[in-house]
């Protein structure tokens, strides 16, 4: 029985050109995390394997950095990065847990709305 839950950073609104950190945390289970995949729609961004470490997809190498922890840092954000991101935890013996984060990347001019943009 899968007892675990995934907590995420929550949805994020950020400014074009900035950076953000996507993070998930698996709790309430003693299952062993064997691998974490980060995906956007149907694209694989990165893999963190318990034995082999990090692999960043070649098409994202220049804008995606591993960490902190099992999280992912997206840099030089573009409006095209707007979308839903998935952290997929492969665990033993539980199976797969998935967390979802929606990222909205806005043109700088939208700052007049008074939104607080996230640029760490």
């Amino acid at each position: 029985m899968m007892t675990g839950t995934i907590e995420t950073t929550g949805n994020i609104s950020a400014e074009k050109g900035g950076s953000i950190i996507l993070q998930c945390h698996l709790s309430s289970t003693t299952a062993q995390v064997t691998q974490v995949n980060w995906e956007q729609q149907d694209q694989l961004l990165a893999i963190c394997n318990a034995d082999l470490g990090w692999h960043i997809s070649p098409s994202f190498k220049d804008r995606v950095a591993p960490g902190p922890g099992l999280g992912l840092t997206l840099q030089s954000l573009t409006v095209n990065d707007t979308g839903e991101y998935f952290c997929i935890y492969h665990t033993y013996p539980d199976g797969t847990y998935t967390g979802r984060i929606f990222l909205e990347v806005l043109e700088s001019s939208v700052a007049e709305h008074g939104a607080r943009f996230q640029i760490p």
Epitope: N11, I21, F102
Partner: antibody, heavy 119, light 112 residues
Framework: EVQLQQSGPELVRPGGSMKISCKAS????????MNWVKQSHGQNLEWIGL????????SYNQKFQGKATLTVDKSSSTAYMELLSLTSEDSAVFYC????????????WGQGTSVTVSS | DVVMTQTPLSLPVSFGDQVSISCRSS???????????LSWYLHKPGQSPQLLIY???NRFSGVPDRFSGSGSGTDFTLKISTIKPEDLGMYYC?????????FGGGTKLEIK
């Protein structure tokens, strides 16, 4: 003036499918997400999902995955929601609503489309 | 999914009254960057829902200042300082911090 004009009421047979349209005007269609909301029994509101006209990406409430399919036609500034394998549980009023940039809220709403599933 | 609990379900009022509607979430609605995506809507019979408040306390364009929002974390409140006839209807809170977005069950503001 921002306006979202939805298609008219629909009567559909159980097992059938249908597509609701939402034509946007008065703003840059690709600059905002488009959300869809279900109102059943004249009360409960449920978020179905959203679509990003700029890149075609989408996000669904898993409850509606396989039930609703969201698409856009950028050339006509129109968003669509197709509803599949309809049952009486799908009888409701469906709204499209523009996303408020930077705040994960909905600022302008269509007038609603009533869908009745009945044989 | 995040559960949004609104109280009361029904709120009988007289015109001129001040009222508060509460909305509680099953999870913290502040994201890792300190932003909280909580909004309030009014749905009048025969009309579409309308945005009143976004980001906890920001009044949307054209919304009278008798409407105010407050709260943090998991506890949020909508206050209406002087009830007018056009304020009657169903009020809903919505959280947009976690996927999927979820609405509260609604509070019906009706005349006593």
């Amino acid at each position: 003036e921002v306006q979202l004009q939805q298609s008219g009421p629909e009567l559909v047979r159980p097992g059938g499918s249908m597509k609701i349209s939402c034509k946007a005007s008065g703003y840059s269609f690709t600059g905002y997400t488009m959300n869809w909301v279900k109102q059943s029994h004249g009360q409960n509101l449920e978020w179905i999902g959203l679509i990003i006209p700029y890149n075609g990406g989408s996000s669904y409430n898993q409850k509606f995955q396989g039930k609703a399919t969201l698409t856009v036609d950028k050339s006509s500034s129109t968003a669509y929601m197709e509803l599949l394998s309809l049952t009486s549980e799908d009888s409701a009023v469906f709204y499209c609503a523009r996303g408020l940039r930077g705040y994960f809220a909905m600022d302008y709403w269509g007038q609603g489309t009533s869908v009745t599933v009945s044989s | 999914d995040v559960v949004m609990t609104q109280t009361p379900l029904s709120l009988p009022v007289s015109f001129g009254d001040q009222v508060s509607i509460s909305c509680r979430s099953s999870q913290n609605l502040t994201n890792s960057y300190g932003n909280t995506y909580l909004s309030w809507y009014l749905h009048k019979p025969g009309q579409s829902p309308q945005l009143l408040i976004y980001g906890i306390s920001n009044r949307f364009s054209g919304v009278p200042d008798r409407f105010s929002g407050s709260g943090s974390g998991t506890d949020f409140t909508l206050k209406i300082s002087t009830i007018k006839p056009e304020d009657l209807g169903m009020y809903y809170c919505l959280q947009g911090t976690h996927q999927p977005w979820t609405f509260g069950g609604g509070t019906k503001l009706e005349i006593k």
